[in-house]
């Protein structure tokens, strides 16, 4: 921290300009008025201050706004944002998407920092939900953003926002997250026709239940193996050989290469071997002919 000393004669800053890079830290502290700095924050970005000088400028703003900076200052922080701690940011009330964009721009190309995570959290909580514009913005800067949210947080995403989601935004989502997102996507895309619907819903299918997969198998969708391998195992197991064949279309041949991996492996174990043989792929491990299959879960339900 810089000790308090009087500003030398003639050095009082009348505006925020490049002459300030020649000031020592104590001179910045003594000669730059915090209120002037606050009103001319947008100029700081154009001046190549040292990190040590930026520390002094931040200290001046902290003294002026001990309860947290107003949005008019936050929007123009520029690279001074990188000096903020999560504790600083928790004091802010950021409501403008433009402010959010300006600060995300500063961190562009870097991993999501604790500061950015805190900023986004404050912004989304302030809005009450993840609306489409916000989601658009966040996934543009951080494609993995959606998958960083808990299922509880994802539940606040309105179906209308799902239109902003791109396939790559879901790459790192786990099944629990897709379980939450799939019904929203189904609702969002419900008025689309068959082929268009499948293109949009495909990325979310890791959360689809069996009955929806059965319905898709009737629509000539030709699901690729990569999508099939991401489906919930419990949703795939009840599908018949005929349904899987219809679901995959020409891609059904890819099952052979995946026969030892879930969900294909577990699905094969549930099928009659003679049904599997009809595919002509040489899939092995099905239930031998003549064996009786008891569905114990059904039996328990009846008793």
């Amino acid at each position: 921290e810089v000790e308090k000393t009087a500003c030398p004669s003639g050095k009082k800053a009348r505006e925020i300009d490049e002459s300030l890079i020649f000031y020592k830290k104590w001179e910045l502290e003594a000669c730059v008025d915090a209120a002037l700095l606050a009103t001319q924050m947008d100029r700081v970005n154009a001046i190549p201050f040292t990190y040590e000088q930026l520390d002094v400028l931040k200290h001046k703003l902290d003294e002026l706004y001990p309860q947290g900076y107003p949005e008019s200052v936050i929007q123009h922080l520029g690279y001074l944002f990188l000096k903020m701690s999560p504790e600083d940011i928790r004091k802010w009330n950021v409501t403008s998407l433009e402010t959010l964009k300006a600060l995300l721009e500063v961190n562009k190309g870097h991993e999501m920092s604790p500061q950015v995570a805190t900023l986004i959290d404050r912004f989304v909580k302030g809005r009450g939900q993840l609306d489409k514009d916000t989601l658009d913005t966040l996934t543009a800067f951080y494609p993995g953003y959606l998958c960083s949210l808990s299922p509880e947080e994802l539940s606040s995403v309105p179906p209308s926002s799902i239109w902003a989601v791109r396939p790559q935004d879901l790459d790192t989502c786990d099944p629990r997250q897709l379980d939450v997102l799939y019904p929203k996507a189904r609702l969002a895309f419900q008025n689309m026709n068959g082929s268009e619907y499948f293109v949009k819903i495909q990325s979310f299918l890791g959360g689809a239940p069996t009955e929806d997969l059965k319905a898709l198998s009737q629509q000539n969708v030709s699901m690729d193996l990569a999508t099939f391998m991401k489906l919930r195992t419990d949703a795939v197991l009840p599908l018949t050989v005929a349904e899987v064949q219809k679901l995959l279309g020409p891609h059904v041949e890819g099952l052979k290469a995946e026969e030892r991996h879930r969900p294909v492996r577990d699905w094969i174990l549930r099928q009659r071997q003679d049904d599997l043989d009809t595919l002509g792929l040489g899939l092995q491990g099905g239930i031998p002919n003549g064996y009786l299959v008891l569905d114990l879960s059904m039996q328990e339900a009846l008793s």
Epitope: E18, D42, R43, N45, A46, I47, P48, F49, T50, H76, G78, Y79, F81, A102, E105, V106, K108
Partner: nanobody
């Protein structure tokens, strides 16, 4: 994306050096550049400044009349011509680039060492 300084070395008092600050991976055109120096055990201090257009320059009082900053955007490089060097000019000289409003990128070089001694 980085700034690379060069041109430092050992020089006698009264001598001269020309330092270069070259950008690699990005274009310097839109950036204001500052030259700074840090002597051992001392605070880093600003030496010179040039605006993105090159139309505005500024200097620390201690180097006015001796140092000249210039830029060649075609070569993506900023120069610091240092004449009449004094022992107190000794230090590590580094350049910094700041992008201005709507461009929050900023870059620092690693520095080049200047020693003025007889």
């Amino acid at each position: 994306l980085q700034l690379v300084e060069s041109g430092g070395g050992l020089v006698q008092p009264g001598g001269f050096l020309r330092l270069s600050c070259a950008a690699s991976g990005f274009t310097l055109d839109y950036y204001a550049i500052g030259w700074f120096r840090q002597a051992p055990g001392k605070e880093r201090e600003g030496v010179s400044y040039i605006s993105s257009s090159g139309g505005s320059t500024n200097y620390a009082d201690s180097v006015k009349g001796r140092f000249t900053i210039s830029r060649d955007n075609a070569k993506n490089t900023v120069y610091l011509q240092m004449n009449s060097l004094k022992p107190e000019d000794t230090g590590v000289y580094s350049c910094a680039a700041a992008g201005g409003y709507g461009n929050s990128s900023r870059y620092w070089g690693q520095g080049t060492s200047v020693t003025v001694s007889s």
